[in-house]
Interface confidence: medium
């Protein structure tokens, strides 16, 4: 047995006479032989579930579910209840109604075996019948919605009449009907005004019925019509077996460059027309088992279950269903020397499915693990400026397919042929297994005899000791210019373009900082800032070279505070900033502030475009359009 609603609403007035019927509660059957029996909870509850008093006023007919006033609720009773409501005005009280047999202990009230009946209390007597509006004569203030389980016997789940109105205003005639399309499984009995299902419902055919209840009020010569929504939701049970969409029960996959733990190797999809078990229970009741194979397979792979709700079309309406993705996942990093082929089977069991048929499927995965060889190009050729500052990134080395690698460890080393000309360093990028070449020793750059730098690049996978080698020729270009005395270590400190471009800073390949002009669109990833190289900084990512010194790119790497409009980076730096962002690495602070536009007035020379002077932009000259100007003014 279950209630067709989890909550009911009615009004209560002071001194309403004993014997006044209030409302019916309805139970629906789970099995044809069940007979409902209703029981009221012992207490009345108020605001925040406060237990107010033993219920001495309202009774229920155990067999019909009719709630009625056993005795009148007078003003003194009401004041007594109000005094116990934690100081809140008592506007609503509620009772719990249970379906027997249930435990006699009055605990939590949870659907389906318990419903709450809420009474809106009015500290006045019942209004004169003539003063009631048609809406008040027809329907409760709170619109009901109904829950009906699929595949269950049909039954009565609602009664339209407002019983207190019918009892106290017998001269007012109220008629009801349901507006519904042809062939819908509901009927409203014209005599009893009971609404019932004609037959058992199938949620997989239709999940929601948006009906309309029509009430016609006759009071003397007056006839008025009131319409309200009458929604019915069909509740699911596990009556559908899992199936393979398009019959696909096998997936084939090759493991080559992606060898990292947690890599998804292949996915097979299972469809289930049901949406039960509910998400909390789903993984426990919808099981997947990797069938025993050899030890290596059991250690190397696991199956992950990813259920997702979806919508499917049935009889012209959409109903929810579930797709279950079963992912074959690497349980550990695979060595680049690993080379084998295997077949895996996964047993999926919808353990709640009762038939007909089986709730079990067998998934098949064919997997080939291929070995990876390390190859480098025969040689690299790069150039570097004599003015480059320490930590300037000048290029990358990368074994074949390194961009596609994950879970493959490659370490790069540089071996210099000229000991006094060892200018460069190399670090392995965690992102793409490439080696980033950077300036490590600026003194060597200045030596006249170091015009050409010769290196051997060695890439090693330490797990297997496999190696690859390549020649690297670096040409040193340009004339050395001494670093300016008044310049900061970090490009990022400069707040304005002229300050930025007159200095160099750590990480600068040209020996000069670069100004990145932002797009001016509020808090944006493309904020204005001063950088050693706009190719690498800021790009929302603190790379392996930038981690070597906070002065290189605090915009990406700072862990300190950011003042002003911004979105912080994860786990550090500035993901997005407002206007111009500059940073003070020693103080572990960045500032993001509006660009300094003050006086964008125009003369005859600049109708289409406006040249905003350095004064207006705080040290920067820039052509901006009417639209930009409006945007800056607006901000």
């Amino acid at each position: 047995l279950y209630f067709s609603r989890d909550a009911y609403w009615e009004k209560l007035y002071v001194d309403q006479p004993a014997g006044t019927p209030l409302l019916y509660v309805h139970a629906l059957r789970d099995a044809p032989e069940e007979v409902p029996s209703f029981r009221l909870g012992q207490h009345l509850y108020g605001t925040y579930r406060t237990r107010l008093h033993e219920n001495n006023w309202i009774c229920i007919q155990e067999d019909t579910g009719l709630l009625y006033l056993n005795r009148s609720l007078d003003r003194s009773s009401w004041e007594k209840l109000s005094g116990r409501n934690r100081g809140f005005p008592l506007l609503t009280v509620y009772l719990k109604v249970f379906l027997s047999p249930t435990s006699l202990r009055e605990g939590e009230c949870q659907w389906p075996g318990c419903a709450r009946v809420y009474f809106s209390f009015f500290n006045t007597s019942f209004p004169a019948c003539t003063s009631l509006k048609p809406r008040e004569l027809c329907f409760p203030e709170t619109r009901p919605s109904f829950r009906i389980r699929e595949n269950r016997p049909p039954g009565t789940f609602h009664q339209f009449r407002l019983l207190p109105v019918q009892f106290l205003c017998p001269n007012i005639s109220v008629a009801y009907r349901l507006l519904e399309g042809e062939g819908l499984p509901f009927r409203c009995a014209p005599d009893s005004l009971e609404v019932s299902t004609r037959w058992a419902l199938d949620r997989e055919q239709r999940e929601k019925y948006e009906l309309v209840a029509v009430c016609t009020v006759h009071a003397g010569a007056r006839e008025e019509v009131v319409m309200v929504p009458f929604p019915v939701t069909v509740y699911d049970e596990d009556d559908s077996a899992p199936t393979f969409p398009a019959g696909v029960d096998t997936a084939s996959a090759v493991v080559e460059f992606k060898r990292k733990e947690d890599t998804v190797v292949a996915t097979l999809r299972v469809f289930d027309a049901d949406v039960v078990p509910a998400s909390g229970e789903l993984v426990r009741r919808y099981t997947s088992t990797l069938l025993p194979g050899d030890t290596w397979t059991q250690q190397t792979f696991r199956v992950e279950h990813w259920p997702n709700e979806t919508s499917v079309q049935a009889n012209g309406s959409f109903v929810r269903a579930t797709v279950h993705d079963y992912r074959l996942v690497l349980n550990r990093n695979l060595s680049i020397s690993e080379n084998r082929t295997m077949q895996l089977a996964v047993l999926v069991n919808d353990s709640d499915f009762q038939g007909p048929g089986a709730g079990v499927l067998l998934l098949h995965f064919n997997v080939s693990v291929l070995p990876v060889s390390l190859h480098l190009p025969s040689s690299y050729s790069l150039s570097v400026s004599r003015r480059a500052r320490r930590f300037a990134q000048i290029g990358k080395v990368c074994v074949e397919n390194c961009q596609a690698f994950s879970g493959i460890n490659v370490q790069y080393e540089l071996h210099s042929s000229g000991a006094n000309c060892s200018t460069l360093g190399v670090v392995t990028s965690a992102e793409d297994t490439s080696g980033i070449l950077f300036v490590n020793d600026t003194k060597a750059l200045r030596r006249p005899k170091c015009a050409e730098l010769h290196y051997m690049v060695v890439a090693t996978n330490h797990q297997t000791s496999r190696q690859a080698q390549a020649q690297l020729l670096v040409t040193v270009e340009g004339l050395y210019v001494a670093e300016e005395a008044g310049c900061p270590l970090s490009c990022a400190v400069s707040k304005r373009r002229p300050e930025c471009e007159e200095c160099g800073g750590l990480g600068s390949p040209t020996g000069r900082c670069e100004w990145r002009q932002g797009d001016g669109k509020g808090i944006t990833r493309n904020f204005s800032t001063c950088s050693p190289s706009t190719k690498t900084c800021p790009d929302g990512h603190c790379d392996v070279v930038e981690t070597q010194d906070i002065n290189i790119c605090p915009q990406d790497c700072l862990r300190g505070s950011i003042v002003g409009g911004h979105e912080p980076g994860e786990p550090r730096g500035i993901k997005a900033g407002y206007g111009t962002c500059n940073c003070f690495p020693e103080e572990e602070k960045c500032f993001c502030e509006p660009e300094d536009i003050q006086d964008p007035l125009c003369d005859e020379l600049c109708r289409e475009q406006k040249l905003i002077s350095e004064e207006d932009l705080g040290g920067e000259q820039k052509l901006i359009s009417e639209e930009d100007l409006h945007h800056h003014h607006h901000h």
């Epitope: 310049c487 400190v493 300050e499 350095e614």
Partner: antibody, heavy 125, light 107 residues
């Protein structure tokens, strides 16, 4: 030793144009973080910033005087020139030039660390 | 333009006194503020940059503090040579602006 010296006419007539020159020594006008500002001070009144030129030749001006001011520099002569048009008796003041540069140790922050002695300009018919 | 309001406009103090001058900006200027001392007939002299950084060669009795909109110049023990007019200057936003000055006189 860093020095700045202002030069220009002592007396100008109303509506005339004033040309002031600041000759610097001990640093280069093209060095990074080396800029020069002009500031004036009417008799018995507060200082007022007029204009600035950066080492990169970018310029900036006081909003209220922008239409009357022009600043420029000649790096080879180590000179910064301020031209002020349409002079008026209220422009009577001592005019200073000052070097604006960054301060050690981090070279983050700026200050006008060296000033000229100033040149007094009287506007009268 | 950002207004810089200095207070008091003038003050009388004795040698050895602790003197505090404040400067308030009409909007936040971070710490982009300098303090300058000017004696009659002389050019101003930079005392403090970045609100609190003492210029080399300036006696340690001078100190600066503050950030955002409120700034203070403190002379911990006034000396005879400190009687002068003091100005604050913001160079956070164009146009750069000076305060109206505080004249420190001998009581």
């Amino acid at each position: 030793q860093v020095t700045l010296k202002e030069s220009g006419p002592v007396l100008v007539k109303p509506t005339e144009t004033l040309t002031l020159t600041c000759t610097v020594s001990g640093f280069s006008l093209s060095s990074a973080r080396m800029g020069v500002s002009w500031i004036r001070q009417p008799p018995g009144k507060a200082l007022e910033w007029l204009a600035h030129i950066f080492s990169t030749d970018e310029k900036s001006y006081s909003t209220s005087l922008k239409s009357r001011l022009s600043i420029s520099k000649d790096t080879s002569l180590s000179q910064v020139v301020l031209i002020m048009t349409n002079m008026d008796p209220v422009d009577t003041a001592t005019y200073y030039c000052a070097r604006r540069t960054t301060m050690a140790p981090y070279y983050y922050y700026y200050g006008m660390d060296v000033w000229g002695h100033g040149t007094t300009v009287t506007v009268s018919s | 333009a950002i207004q810089m309001t200095q207070s008091p406009a003038s003050l009388s103090a004795s040698v050895g006194d602790r003197v505090t001058i404040t400067c308030r900006a009409s909007q936040g200027i971070r710490n982009d503020l300098g303090w300058y001392q000017q004696k009659p007939g002389k050019a101003p002299k930079l005392l403090i940059s970045a609100a609190s950084s003492l210029q080399s060669g300036v006696p340690s009795r001078f100190s600066g503090s503050g950030s955002g909109t409120d700034f203070t110049l403190t002379i911990s023990s006034l000396q005879p040579e400190d009687f002068a007019t003091y100005y604050c200057l913001q160079d956070y936003k164009y146009p750069w602006t000076f305060g109206q000055g505080t004249k420190v006189e001998i009581k």
